[in-house]
Interface confidence: medium
């Protein structure tokens, strides 16, 4: 740099502001250097010396140019229903998102504070609106001529098969049973699955408990006196 170039700190002109990446120190009444991301102000500037910056310690960070005396603490480790999508470094906070089969019931500035398992639609109900990263599954009763015989957060109502001769008529939770050797037309013989909507980045997918198991206790939100949503299991 040229020999005569002035370095911070310097006194700004009256009515002027400090340059970008500098801040005005009220005590010194000087424009001083900010610390870069991953650092914090170890010693504030004076009229004759610039800000002294130091690296953030383990498990702390600063994301912006700053003059804070201490780095911010990274958030706590991700819970079992979450996946760490961004690690804690000197320049960024840890970010936790919900694992597949769960959605974010309580978000924070970045990532999720509280995950909840996606609602499962019980037999006789199908998925009307799939779950997203931040919203639960919406179930609806299967309309006449359709059925769902599964407890699932992805299965939609499927049309009954059409028989030449009906042995047992279908209902909302069961397909029609035909007497002839084969139906004239079968609509979607297998279960129709919607794509898993949440946190597909994770490779650590764990199977969601089936309704025959005990209700999950890994997530407890005060529900108040209202009953579970119609067509959903108690999960």
């Amino acid at each position: 740099l040229p020999a005569q170039v002035a370095f911070t700190p310097y006194a700004p002109e009256p009515g002027s502001t400090c340059r970008l990446r500098e801040y005005y120190d009220q005590t010194a009444q000087m424009c001083c250097s900010k610390c870069s991301p991953g650092q914090h102000a170890k010693v504030f500037c004076t009229k004759t010396s610039d800000t002294v910056c130091d690296s953030c310690e383990d498990s702390t960070y600063t994301q912006l140019w700053n003059w804070v005396p201490e780095c911010l603490s990274c958030g706590s480790r991700c819970s079992s229903d979450q996946v760490e999508t961004q690690a804690c470094t000197r320049e960024q906070n840890r970010i936790c998102t919900c694992r597949p089969g769960w959605y974010c019931a309580l978000s924070k500035q970045e990532g999720c504070r509280l995950c909840a398992p996606l609602r499962k639609c019980r037999p006789g109900f199908g998925v009307a609106r799939p779950g997203t990263e931040t919203s639960d599954v919406v179930c609806k009763p299967c309309a006449p001529g359709t059925f769902s015989n599964t407890t699932s957060s992805t299965d939609i109502c499927r049309p009954h098969q059409i028989c030449n001769v009906v042995a047992i008529p279908g209902n909302a939770s069961m397909d029609a049973v035909c007497t002839s050797t084969s139906p004239t037309r079968s609509m979607a013989p297998g279960a129709v699955h919607l794509p898993q909507p949440v946190s597909t980045r994770s490779q650590h997918t764990q199977p969601t408990p089936e309704p025959s198991t005990a209700p999950s206790t890994s997530f407890l939100l005060p529900m108040g006196p209202s009953p579970p949503a119609e067509g959903s299991t108690g999960d």
Partner: antibody, heavy 123, light 107 residues
């Protein structure tokens, strides 16, 4: 090599708004401040304001603080300047220019300039 | 705001001559001054920074001098390609300000 590619000429009606863009290439966009300069035959070169793309921090010439708003998108290495409530006085060539500003020093000059965007405000 | 005054709007010179363009600041700006060259239809180009340091892309016939309030850009052995307008600029403090420009005309 460093290049600043500005959007094409604009002809707009008085009272309208316009957004000019400046796409940077050939260097790390967030490492350098981006400044905007207005040029007219009457007033010559006038500094409008600046943005630090790394932080989004901005600085403005008081004369333009209600007229201009500068932003930057790191993902596309593009700086933008919105000009509001346009009048014939805003007809000019607008340049984006990179500031060399050495961190921690007063050294600060414009080493690369865009080709300029001509703005015409006319009814 | 700091006012940068280039009192001569036009200067006439001949190829091979030496010419000096002056700029006066309304208050002390130290050496926080740059000089720019702008050819017709082109963007400005930096020639001098920190009052006296030649930018890497500028020919060595361009020199800068001065500090405080009075600054000079000198072009030695003027060439026809030096036909342009020259602007001084202070970067001591926001808002950065430019001089009104001096047009160099080749006789």
């Amino acid at each position: 090599q460093v290049q600043l590619q500005q959007s094409g000429a604009e002809v707009v009606r008085p009272g309208a708004s316009v957004t000019l863009s400046c796409k940077a290439s050939g260097y790390t966009f967030s490492d350098y401040e981006m400044h905007w300069v207005k040029q007219t035959p009457v007033h010559g070169l006038e500094w409008i304001g600046a943005i630090d793309p790394e932080t989004g921090d901005t600085a403005y010439n008081q004369k333009f603080k209600d007229k201009a708003r500068v932003t930057a998108d790191k993902s596309s290495s593009t700086a933008y300047m919105e000009l509001r409530s346009l009048t014939s006085e805003d007809s000019a060539v607008y340049y984006c220019t990179r500031d060399i500003h050495y961190y921690g020093s007063s050294l600060s000059y414009f080493d690369y300039w865009g080709q300029g965007t001509t703005l015409t405000v006319s009814s | 705001d700091i006012v940068m005054t280039q009192s001569q709007k036009f200067m006439s010179t001949s190829v091979g001559d030496r010419v000096s363009v002056t700029c006066k600041a309304s208050q002390n700006v130290g050496t926080n001054v740059a000089w720019y060259q702008q050819k017709p239809g082109q963007s400005p180009k930096v020639m001098i920074y920190s009052a006296s340091y030649r930018y890497s892309g500028a020919p060595d016939r361009f020199t800068g001098s001065g500090s405080g309030t009075d600054f000079t850009l000198t072009v030695n052995n003027v060439q026809s390609e030096d036909l342009a307008e020259y602007f001084c600029q202070q970067y001591k403090t926001y808002p950065y300000t430019f001089g009104g420009g001096t047009k160099l005309e080749i006789e």
